[in-house]
Amino acid sequence: SEVEYRAEVGQNAYLPCFYTPAAPGNLVPVCWGKGACPVFECGNVVLRTDERDVNYWTSRYWLNGDFRKGDVSLTIENVTLADSGIYCCRIQIPGIMNDEKFNLKLVIKPAKVTPAPTRQRDFTAAFPRMLTTRGHGPAETQTLGSLPDINLTQISTLANELRDSRLANDLRDSGATIRIG
């Protein structure tokens, strides 16, 4: 069964997918598609990488992580209810039938009205709707543009700390991780 992730209408959705490249010059092509992973390739491709770059994407879909180090998690910008459904992350390992396939279910909830965040300086204040839970729980994220007044250095530091610690560990535990080589 698919791992389920949730986001609110108007926010950015985050669908985690990771692998470990064997060597810097040998990234594995990855495709993301809307719909469950078929036998080959991805259906309804929304984004694709090659041995070095993001080489195809459609509006609102991008990789916010360090895809050259194997973080090929998909960000969907400004989601609507129509974005609900199954998404396929396919790590296209060379060789016959070697691909790793991950089906991730995205559930979009109607937007809630929330009070303005307080100006604390912890992760909750900086990322007021960023929720991650260990295992198969929900993962939500919001755009950098809607953060409270935090300077650029703080944003970089917070984002890096979050990615390098809790977020990376929690999402890797969700199962969408593969080591290559």
């Epitope: 060597a23 810097p24 010059g25 070095r52 991008w62 050259r68 910008e77 970089s156």
Partner: antibody, heavy 118, light 107 residues
């Protein structure tokens, strides 16, 4: 230490071709991409393409497809760029640059000046 | 192609001043932006990679940061040797594109 040594300046006639070289030393040549970048006098930088010596894979900026051809000789740790059907628009300084940390271009050659004139 | 719009084109500053250069990407490029310094008659030199990482040996007066698709490069205390043209560059997707450059001149 790491170095990229490029060949000397070239003065060529319109319609001719030129092949410039970039000899790498101080690191494992097959482990890093070699990029080529164009800079016209007093202007900005334009990425032409890259070649990965470990596999001979290449990627070109569409604008330079048919104009430039990238090759490597791993035995001499040298990358080459051939420019064909030269016009005055091709007069520029051409740099080779290695892609290292996070794929940014961390080491650059000194540049090769190509002047196209009759 | 992804367009990198760099501002300003020219900066005239005094030693000790703080300066900031901005590049705006025409679409998301994640953190895949580098900043280069090109002194007169020289090759470009890498200063910042992956938006905010200072390259080996680069003085800590040079910093980079990201806010969405806006990337900033700051020299906290300008020195005479900082006379150069500064370029941003994205390598999220090919063709890798550079900003138009900012020429920093010292009073």
């Amino acid at each position: 230490q790491i170095q990229l040594q490029q060949s000397g300046p070239e003065l060529v006639k319109p319609g001719a071709s030129v092949k410039i070289s970039c000899k790498a030393s101080g690191y494992t040549f097959t482990d890093y991409y070699i990029n080529w970048v164009k800079q016209r006098p007093g202007q900005g930088l334009e990425w032409i393409g890259w070649i990965y010596p470990g596999s001979d894979n290449t990627k070109y900026n569409e604008k330079f497809k048919g104009k430039s051809t990238l090759t490597v000789d791993t035995s001499s740790s040298t990358a080459y760029m051939q420019l064909s059907s030269l016009t005055s628009e091709d007069s520029a300084v051409y740099f080779c640059a290695r892609s290292g940390n996070y794929y940014a271009m961390d080491y650059w050659g000194q540049g090769t000046s190509v002047t196209v004139s009759s | 192609s992804i367009v990198m719009t760099q501002t300003p084109k020219f900066l005239l500053v005094s030693p000790g001043d703080r300066v900031t250069i901005t590049c705006r990407a025409s679409q998301s490029v994640s953190n895949n932006v580098a900043w280069y310094q090109q002194r007169p008659g020289q090759s470009p030199k890498l200063l910042i990679y992956y938006a905010s990482n200072r390259y080996t040996g680069v003085p800590d007066r040079f910093t980079g940061s990201r806010y969405g698709t806006d990337f900033s490069f700051t020299i906290s205390t300008v020195q005479a040797e900082d006379l150069a043209v500064y370029f941003c560059q994205q390598d999220y997707s090919s063709p890798y594109t550079f900003g138009g450059g900012t020429k920093l001149e010292i009073k």
